[in-house]
Each structure stands twice: as structure tokens, then as C-alpha cells.
Amino acid sequence: ESALITQQDLAPQQRAAPQQKRSSPSEGLCPPGHHISEDGRDCISCKYGQDYSTHWNDLLFCLRCTRCDSGEVELSPCTTTRNTVCQCEEGTFREEDSPEMCRKCRTGCPRGMVKVGDCTPWSDIECVHKESGTKHSGEVPAVEETVTSSPGTPASPCSLSG
């Protein structure tokens, strides 16, 4: 997945450290894992585990690696070409509407509804009406039955900022 870059992502490094590898830009751009020098003549490698760039770019800095929050697990570490992949801990999920935090999955469905989908790192349990089979869109059920969900096995990683 491709990230959109925001102000906070830029790593505060303007000068290349002596050990950083350099190469020449291609058509004014540097390859993934590099950023362009201020004079535009060199491509400077990102620092492994500290910053990264995922696409061809003319970025003056590589982007700072994300650190997973508490309540998240690190699925894969930051490399020079890919940001850290963080995923919500078991029993919690991250919605697209609120990507900043992991929220607790509900433990059961409201009365008159049945569970058809487990808690995953990117979705709450899914409930449908017993009769009609229509989905329940409410945030928190008013009354819960004793139907509980065990966290589902992730089918694919959910990248917050990769």
C-alpha cells in the first residue's frame, strides 16, 4: 500500500551521514530507499530502521519510520523501502473511519441478532438480524446476549501507515 506523506512523517535529517550510500538520480528522481540531495545531484540512501521511502521520489528527506502504539503488534519492521506494519492486538480492531486507535471488539450481538463475522484486527464482530439477515450498523449494542466471539485469525495484515 502507498502512503500519503504528511508533515510529521519527514525525518529530521538534512545532511547525509558519511556511511550513507549515494547514487545518481534518474530523470530527476531517486529510487525507493533513497531521497534526493539538496543540490539534486545525488540519491542518498535512507537509514535502515530509522527512515524509508517507498516510491521513486524527489523527497529532500526520507520518511520517519512509524513506531507501533501500545495496543498494537508489529507485523513487520521498518526497512529502507517499507514503513513498519502495525496491527491491532487480538480482541481489538481499527476502523477506516477512526484509524488513529484500536477499539475493543464487541463481545456479542444484540438480542434478536446472530454473529456472522468474527473480530479481526480491521473489523468488529458482524451481526445480522435473525429474521431478515440485514446487518447491524449500531456502534454498541444496548443489550447483549451471552453469544461471545473469539478473536478471528487475521487473513491479511492491516497496515496503518505502510
Partner: nanobody, 125 residues
Framework: EVQLLESGGGEVQPGGSLRLSCAAS????????MGWFRQAPGKEREFVSA????????YYAESVKGRFTISRDDAKSTLYLQMSSLRAEDTAVYYC??????????????????WGQGTLVTVKP
């Protein structure tokens, strides 16, 4: 809430050029990352290019490197995509996207961004 309106799409011959514009309204976009994605018929939406805040640099997909140039005019709250040396495989609906907050690294097509309605670019002889 941000509204995004793309324009500039159309039909062009291979090798031709087009300039897409994306006008943002609802808030100032100067501190926000913006970008372009595209979706060809029957294919997944794919990243094209992104512009970092404050002219700190840009990102390009390898498929458009050297042919497309992204730029922005924060005073006009407008993002541009200059497309040249267009190929048949560039035919797609092009979508403008803006990050929801300046603090959070917002993800791509499946993430929490604001999306425009899209503008169709057709490249054919």
C-alpha cells in the same frame, strides 16, 4: 469536511499530454499531503503520485516516472498532475485524494482519505 473536484480529463492520442486539476474546498490544504490514484477498467485502484506538504518533495509510481509531474498551489487549494508521453495503459479514471489529518500518516486506497469523484482519461489512436 473536504470536497475535491477533479477536471482536465479527456481523450488524447498516444504520446499526447493532459493536465489534471483538483480543486479542494472546505479547508486549507497547505499542511496536508495530497495525491493522485487511478483505476483502469477491471483493475484495482493504484497509486500514481503524491505531494508532500510545503514543497518538501513528491512521490511517483514507477510506471509514470519521468512522464508525469505533480504540483500544487496551496494559495488556490489546487493540486495538478501534468501528464505527458501518454500511453494506452494510462487510460483510467484519475482520483484526487487528500490526507484527513496532518498528524497521521494516512494510508492509500483502502485508508481514511478524502476522495474526489474522478476524471476519465482515455488514451487511444
Amino acid at each position: 469536511e473536504v470536497q475535491l473536484l477533479e477536471s482536465g480529463g479527456g481523450e488524447v492520442q498516444p504520446g499526447g499530454s493532459l493536465r489534471l486539476s483538483c480543486a479542494a474546498s472546505g479547508r486549507s490544504i497547505s499542511n496536508y499531503a495530497m495525491g493522485w490514484f487511478r483505476q483502469a477498467p477491471g483493475k484495482e485502484r493504484e497509486f500514481v503520485s503524491a505531494s508532500v506538504w510545503n514543497n518538501a518533495g513528491n512521490y511517483y509510481a514507477e510506471s509514470v516516472k519521468g512522464r508525469f509531474t505533480i504540483s500544487r498551489d496551496d494559495a488556490k487549494s489546487t493540486l495538478y498532475l501534468q501528464m505527458s508521453s501518454l500511453r494506452a495503459e494510462d487510460t483510467a479514471v484519475y482520483y484526487c485524494v487528500v490526507a484527513r489529518t496532518p498528524e497521521t500518516p494516512i494510508t492509500s486506497a483502502r485508508g481514511a482519505n478524502y476522495w474526489g469523484q474522478g476524471t476519465l482519461v482515455t488514451v487511444k489512436p
